[in-house]
Interface confidence: medium
């Protein structure tokens, strides 16, 4: 069974951006070899979270976790398996 | 296909605790009919997050999101589906 | 692999209209304060970022999605 | 239904030793700063909560897991 893989580096970057943590953002972006213009762009997004205070960070973190743990995402893992099993069955 | 259901009320409570949001915690705990001693216990956990500042909230939020979106959790959804499909096949 | 629903959320945050983005958030969390906040953030990003900035942000996302750490 | 890995994380946070909890976190996020933070939180909770508090917290979790909202 092919397991669903869920991109931990994405959540590292998202949490760094949403929590206004510039050091954590730099660390995460280094891991994906981001260029200077790319870092600048991500920092502009981060600025919006910082300017709008804690309300933005908490609520948007809640939204992201809600989406990530929703049936849409969990169901995606299930769907991949069903496709694999279909192929395996047809291939016999 | 039975979709994986992932307990949104758990994440509401977790984020309320980890973000030190007492009001959001109260709201979430009311939804599960928590008693006063139960609320007090959850608020003690919340105090630890508050005392340790924003970094605790960010990092622990990151851990929870990583676990929730890990292969272990996504794989659980997949496993449930495989079991269902096995039963369906055997039942034919 | 990133979940498509998460990818859609981020794509709309960068390339969608405020209405499209907020509508998508509403499917997951419909509290007034969440929806109004989502619009504040989306408008901020649209005001702060040039087209080039958005292309660079999308390029970062592409690097994230194709990274061995994803 | 809650994912067992999440359930295990929360159970160890309440009932495990600091070493057991941190070891479990390390399986998912092995950054030193994350593990250090996990230990600080775990020690704080152990210091602050009585056995009765922990039983009450586990009872809340039970209510969460059996709730129609879960």
């Amino acid at each position: 069974v092919k397991m669903a893989e869920t991109c931990p580096i994405f959540y590292d970057v998202f949490f760094a951006v949403a929590n206004g943590n510039e050091l954590l953002l730099d660390l995460s972006l280094t891991k994906v070899n981001a260029t200077e213009p790319e870092r600048t762009a991500m920092k502009k997004i981060q600025d919006c979270y910082v300017e709008n205070g804690l309300i933005s960070r908490v609520l948007d973190g809640l939204v992201m976790t809600t989406i990530s743990s929703s049936k849409d995402c969990m169901g995606e893992a299930v769907q991949n398996t069903v496709e694999d099993l279909k192929l395996n069955t047809l291939g016999r | 296909v039975k979709m994986a259901e992932t307990c949104p009320i758990f994440y509401d409570v977790f984020f309320a605790v980890a973000n030190g949001n007492e009001l959001l915690l109260d709201l979430s705990l009311t939804k599960v009919n928590a008693t006063e001693p139960e609320r007090t216990a959850m608020k003690k956990i919340q105090d630890c997050y508050v005392e340790n500042g924003l970094i605790s909230r960010v990092l622990d939020g990151l851990v929870m999101t990583t676990i929730s979106s890990s292969k272990d959790c996504m794989g659980e959804a997949v496993q449930n589906t495989v079991e269902d499909l096995k039963l369906n096949t055997l039942g034919r | 692999e990133i979940c498509p629903a998460v990818k859609r959320d981020v794509d709309l945050f960068l390339t969608g209209t405020p209405d499209e983005y907020v509508e998508q958030v509403a499917q997951y969390k419909a509290l007034p304060v969440v929806l109004e906040n989502a619009r504040i953030l989306k408008n901020c990003v649209d005001a702060k970022m040039t087209e080039e900035d958005k292309e660079n942000a999308l390029s970062v996302l592409d690097k994230i999605y194709t990274s061995p750490l994803c | 239904e809650i994912c067992p890995a999440v359930k295990r994380d929360v159970d160890l946070f309440l009932t495990g030793t600091p070493d057991e909890y941190v070891e479990q976190v390390a399986q998912y996020k092995a950054l030193p700063v994350v593990l250090e933070n996990a230990r600080i939180l775990k020690n704080c909770v152990d210091a602050k909560m009585t056995e009765e508090d922990k039983e009450n917290a586990l009872s809340v979790l039970d209510k969460i897991y059996t709730s129609p909202l879960c």
């Epitope: 309300i55 | 009001l23 | 007034p32 | -």
Partner: antibody, heavy 121, light 107 residues
Framework: QVQLQQPGTELVRPGASVKLSCKAS????????INWVKQRPGQGLEWIGN????????NYNQKFKDKATLTVDKSSSTAYMQLSSPTSDDSAVYYC??????????????WGQGTTLTVSS | NIVMTQSPKSMSMSVGERVTLSCKAS??????VFWYQQKPDQSPKLLIY???NRYTGVPDRFTGSRSATDFTLTISNVQAEDLADYHC?????????FGAGTKLELK
């Protein structure tokens, strides 16, 4: 300091539409939601709707959907509410109020003085 | 729409007494409840938000509390300047709704 300025009174004939104004100062107008609230003499408060000045997006109470139209003029930091085909039921005090952005909760932190609208022939 | 029911409609008090105003929501509104004070010919002023948070500058004799869908505003040691209308409201879902108000009068 933050201020929301509204005219004290407006007189309008039945059926003739009227546009109430609310001039904001002392803060970044485009960053805060503006809400409108109705109060009839001796009665409670009724939420009409709100508008986000940055992109003019509106949320309406269904009850006022066909009655009120909310707009803003960013250049003058002014919010407007137009009431169509007014009747005596629309005679009331109308307040504009700003939604606070601090914390995770929703509240109105600043209010205008209110405009008393009289619909009379 | 969520209905917020305030009681009593009015009450007469003497200076120094303790007052309890009630507000009941027709369904779950979490802690998304606020209280406003409105004096004659003035606009409302925020007292409490999020059910129990006292707004900046509000005297600590004003306290908000919540039990499920029942919300209470308590004024301990009522002063003459507290005589006013008190409105509760909810922001849990659109449309935002308010109670009909409670008038606090002097005996």
């Amino acid at each position: 300091q933050v201020q929301l300025q509204q005219p004290g009174t407006e007189l309008v004939r039945p059926g003739a539409s009227v546009k109430l104004s609310c001039k904001a100062s002392g803060y970044t107008f485009t960053s805060y939601w503006i809400n409108w609230v109705k109060q009839r003499p001796g009665q409670g408060l009724e939420w009409i709707g709100n508008i986000y000045p940055s992109d003019s997006y509106t949320n309406y109470n269904q009850k006022f959907k066909d009655k009120a139209t909310l707009t803003v003029d960013k250049s003058s930091s002014t919010a407007y509410m137009q009431l169509s085909s007014p009747t005596s039921d629309d005679s009331a005090v109308y307040y504009c109020t700003r939604r606070g952005n601090y914390g995770n909760l929703y509240y109105f932190d600043y209010w205008g003085q209110g405009t008393t609208l009289t619909v009379s022939s | 729409n969520i209905v917020m029911t305030q009681s009593p409609k009015s009450m007469s008090m003497s200076v120094g007494e303790r007052v309890t105003l009630s507000c009941k929501a027709s369904e779950n509104v979490g802690s998304y409840v606020f209280w406003y004070q409105q004096k004659p010919d003035q606009s409302p002023k925020l007292l409490i938000y999020g059910a129990s948070n006292r707004y900046t500058g509000v005297p600590d004799r004003f306290t908000g509390s919540r039990s499920a869908t029942d919300f209470t505003l308590t004024i301990s040691n009522v002063q003459a300047e507290d005589l006013a209308d008190y409105h509760c409201g909810q922001s849990y879902s659109y449309p935002l709704t308010f109670g009909a108000g409670t008038k606090l009068e002097l005996k």
